[in-house]
């Protein structure tokens, strides 16, 4: 017997799709060897139609895929737009030739079934409405009209013109005539459920002179759309349920054994397992909406359904749309930290991966907010101004070609705790969710700036020092001037660097920056930080006020400006942590209204197109001492 296993017989109808799963023994060789799907010919030769090596035959072009799931020891062959010509014998198998390990699969594709001439076939999806048309002769114009459903030999009345309605069709069935028509009546059945399927008979009149019509009603469960996504990537469920439910609450649920558990709905319900990584966005006034989930995990795989009902919960007989999500563990998206920890007054440096092939894409960082359907307003971007409330403490450092950019947030407060998203206007799969946890500081900060009340006088020399501990001895120290388009590195002087590392004196490790002479435009936020190559570490910020020599009052009270920076920062901004639940997420609708519209986020900053280059000191009056 072959160790490969799959469905022996697959049957479908023209125009449909099939997904054939083949199971193989879990060995390293099997996981990585070629997978194939071939058609058995009369001559015994099996002609390859598709393989995991990238081969795709002409007859399968644009309608088939083969996906390997090594973690499950399975591979799936999807074939769409079936025709009767696809009927035949096939093999799914493993190996460099089509004579290796295989399993025989018989595929039969039939024509869409036909019914007797007098039977009208109605095909509707669950939750929709069917209108059954019933014709009659003039002689029965004033006779009783009815619709019954065949159950074995009997035909049970569903509704009739005497206003009788079967209890199971109450509030769902109506019998009516249109305009002045004298030879046709109609029956509407709404909120269709699977048990409504079957053969119906319309009747006008009684006895042998009665006019009868047969109607075959097929109520279809939604065919799930198959979605294949990589681990840590994102998925968007596009839901279009039609105008008739435009004003009802919408939901996305995940099917389990007994029920469909709501993940998110427009009434504010959200599943905690998706905290910080899910977003529901209305698309238009016709009831279309989308749900975006980022940071996909293996356990996110499964069956999803979107629907509409005033309760925001799944309800039998209401329209639904379905998907089956597969999460492939062989992901191109690197594993990045999902929880970053900081302390009040301290800083965090968050590394955001992006598709290295898209180094010129615009980079963004947004804060997920849990109100209503969730949103994620952009806080900073390569061409977006830093949002109000984050001036002087937030910067994005792009590192072109490295496949990552860094976002630094300092002067942390407990209000900064929450979920943040890294995203670009390029490959929409590369969206990562970070949970920032800010705890109260329990010790002095590692980086300290003196003087703390920094007021410089125009025309004079002003020096500011940053004290760092010995643990930062080998790291690069820098000063930068913060502006809305980044933090521009300044020349600085490291006074601790002259000592040998063996005799590091904790008290004399200083990196200083001098403004000589001080100009009015030197006023603003300055950061002292440490980094190793492209890896940014801790930072601290100080506001430097600039005043005229003659005036006594500074432009801004530096004590107030620096208040945020005085709390003791963290010991280790990004201590390693286990992956923790990242919950509800929702983004700025302008970013997520459509996968293609993310570039519009840059429009916030039309007047400021400079990018925050962390390596530039241009335009600054800082100089080395």
């Amino acid at each position: 017997q072959s160790p490969i296993f799959g469905p022996q017989d697959v049957s479908s109808i023209e125009g449909n799709s099939v997904s054939i799963t083949c199971y193989y023994p879990d060995t390293s060789v099997n996981r990585h060897t070629r997978k194939y799907w071939c058609r058995q010919g009369a001559n015994g030769y099996c002609a390859t139609l598709i393989s995991s090596n990238g081969y795709l035959s002409k007859e399968y072009s644009g309608r088939a895929s083969l996906i390997n799931f090594p973690e499950n020891s399975t591979f799936v062959i999807n074939i769409a737009h079936l025709t009767q010509e696809d009927t035949g014998s096939y093999k799914c198998g493993l190996g460099t030739t089509n004579r290796g390990l295989f399993f025989d699969v018989s595929l039969e594709v039939s024509q869409v079934p036909e019914f007797p001439n007098d039977t009208h076939v109605y095909t509707k999806d669950i939750g929709r409405t069917v209108t059954i048309e019933c014709r009659f002769k003039e002689g029965n114009a004033h006779s009783k009209k009815s619709l019954c459903k065949k159950r074995g030999e009997a035909c049970e009345v569903v509704i009739d013109s005497t206003e009788y309605v079967d209890p199971s069709y109450k509030d769902r069935a109506i019998l009516f005539m249109k305009g002045t028509s004298r030879d046709i009546f109609y029956v509407n059945i709404s909120h269709l459920i699977p048990s409504d399927a079957g053969l119906y008979v319309c009747q006008a009149g009684e006895g042998p002179s009665a006019d009868k019509n047969n109607a075959d009603l097929q109520v279809l469960e939604p065919e799930p759309e198959l979605l294949y996504k990589d681990l840590r990537s994102s998925v968007t469920f596009e839901c279009d349920l039609g105008r008739e439910v435009a004003n009802d609450a919408k939901y996305l649920c995940r099917k389990n054994k007994e029920t469909c558990d709501v993940i998110i709905n427009t009434l504010g319900k959200r599943d905690p397992a998706f905290e910080g990584r899910i977003l529901l966005t209305p698309r238009d006034d016709n009831g279309r909406f989308s749900v975006l989930i980022t940071g996909l995990r293996k356990e996110d795989a499964g069956h999803y359904q979107c629907g509409a009902h005033s309760s925001g919960l799944p309800q039998e007989g209401w329209p639904v749309q379905a998907w089956q999500l597969f999460v492939n563990e062989e992901s191109t998206i690197p594993n990045s930290r999902s929880v970053v920890k900081g302390v009040t007054g301290g800083s965090v440096a968050i590394v955001c991966p992006y598709n290295p092939k898209e180094s010129s894409s615009l980079k963004y960082w947004c804060h997920w907010e849990a109100d209503e359907n969730g949103r994620c307003p952009v806080l900073v971007g390569t061409q977006a101004l830093v949002q109000e409330g984050y001036e002087g403490r937030l910067a994005l450092f792009d590192q072109p070609g490295s496949g990552a950019y860094t976002v630094i947030l300092n002067q942390l407060t407990t209000q900064d705790s929450g979920f943040y998203w890294c995203l670009t206007d390029g490959d929409s799969r590369w969206r990562t969710t970070i949970e920032l946890q800010v705890a109260e500081a329990t010790k002095k900060p590692d980086l300290e700036v003196t003087p703390q009340n920094a007021t410089a006088v125009i025309g004079e020399t002003f020096t500011i020092s940053c004290h760092y501990p010995c643990k930062f001895y080998s790291q690069e120290k820098y000063w930068c001037k913060w502006s809305n388009d980044g933090c521009h590195i300044l020349p600085s002087h490291d006074e601790g660097a002259r000592q040998s590392s063996v005799s590091c004196d904790q008290s004399s490790q200083i990196v200083s920056m001098t403004l000589n002479p001080v100009k009015k435009e030197d006023e603003g936020w300055y950061w002292c930080g440490v980094k190793e190559g492209q890896v940014y570490g801790e930072t601290t910020a100080i506001y430097v006020a600039v005043e005229e020599r003659t005036r006594g009052s500074p432009h801004i009270n530096p004590t107030d400006a620096n208040a945020r920076a005085k709390d003791a920062p963290e010991e280790e901004a990004m201590e390693s942590s286990v992956r923790e639940d990242e919950n509800k997420a929702n983004l700025d609708p302008r970013l997520f209204a459509d996968e293609r519209e993310i570039q519009n986020a840059g429009d916030q900053a039309q007047e400021n197109r400079a990018s925050g280059n962390a390596g530039s000191a241009g335009g600054q009056s800082g100089s080395s001492k």
Epitope: Q8, D9, V18, I20, E221, P224
Partner: nanobody, 130 residues
Framework: EVQLVESGGGLVQTGGSLRLSCAAS????????MGWFRQAPGKEREFVAA??????????YVGDSVQGRFTISRDAAGNTVYLQMNSVKPEDTAVYYC?????????????????????WGKGTLVTVSS
């Protein structure tokens, strides 16, 4: 509450045929997959056959030991599944259990694994005499 009721078991001679039925009932229970497993005294539960459907597409799976002899089918409504047993052998003697799934599972889940089935019947005994 979902119920699976097997019928059709009994005594049959070697080489003979038997047809087992399994009816699923329960308000709004609309199964997505149904299957048959069997258990002989002192042995583990063994996969016999399964049928899975999605819209107008049907997938049939058959266990190695019954390949070419047993076939699985279902009625048009999808709530009853049949196991046609032909050319039976003494080693086919076992209690035959019906299984059902209401939720479409990830298609990478192996139908041969009893743990991945949600609902089970009480079983029907098939005895093959030589």
């Amino acid at each position: 509450e979902v119920q699976l009721v097997e019928s059709g078991g009994g005594l049959v001679q070697t080489g003979g045929s038997l047809r087992l039925s399994c009816a699923a009932s329960g308000r709004t229970f609309s199964p997505y997959a149904m299957g048959w497993f069997r258990q002989a005294p002192g042995k583990e539960r063994e996969f016999v056959a399964a049928i899975r459907w999605s819209g107008a597409t049907t997938y049939k799976y058959v266990g190695d030991s019954v390949q070419g002899r047993f076939t699985i089918s279902r009625d048009a409504a999808g709530n009853t599944v049949y196991l046609q047993m032909n050319s039976v052998k003494p080693e086919d003697t076992a209690v035959y259990y019906c299984a059902a799934d209401r939720v479409p599972k990830d298609i990478s889940i192996d139908p041969r694994n009893p743990k991945d089935w949600d609902y089970w019947g009480k079983g029907t005994l098939v005895t093959v005499s030589s």
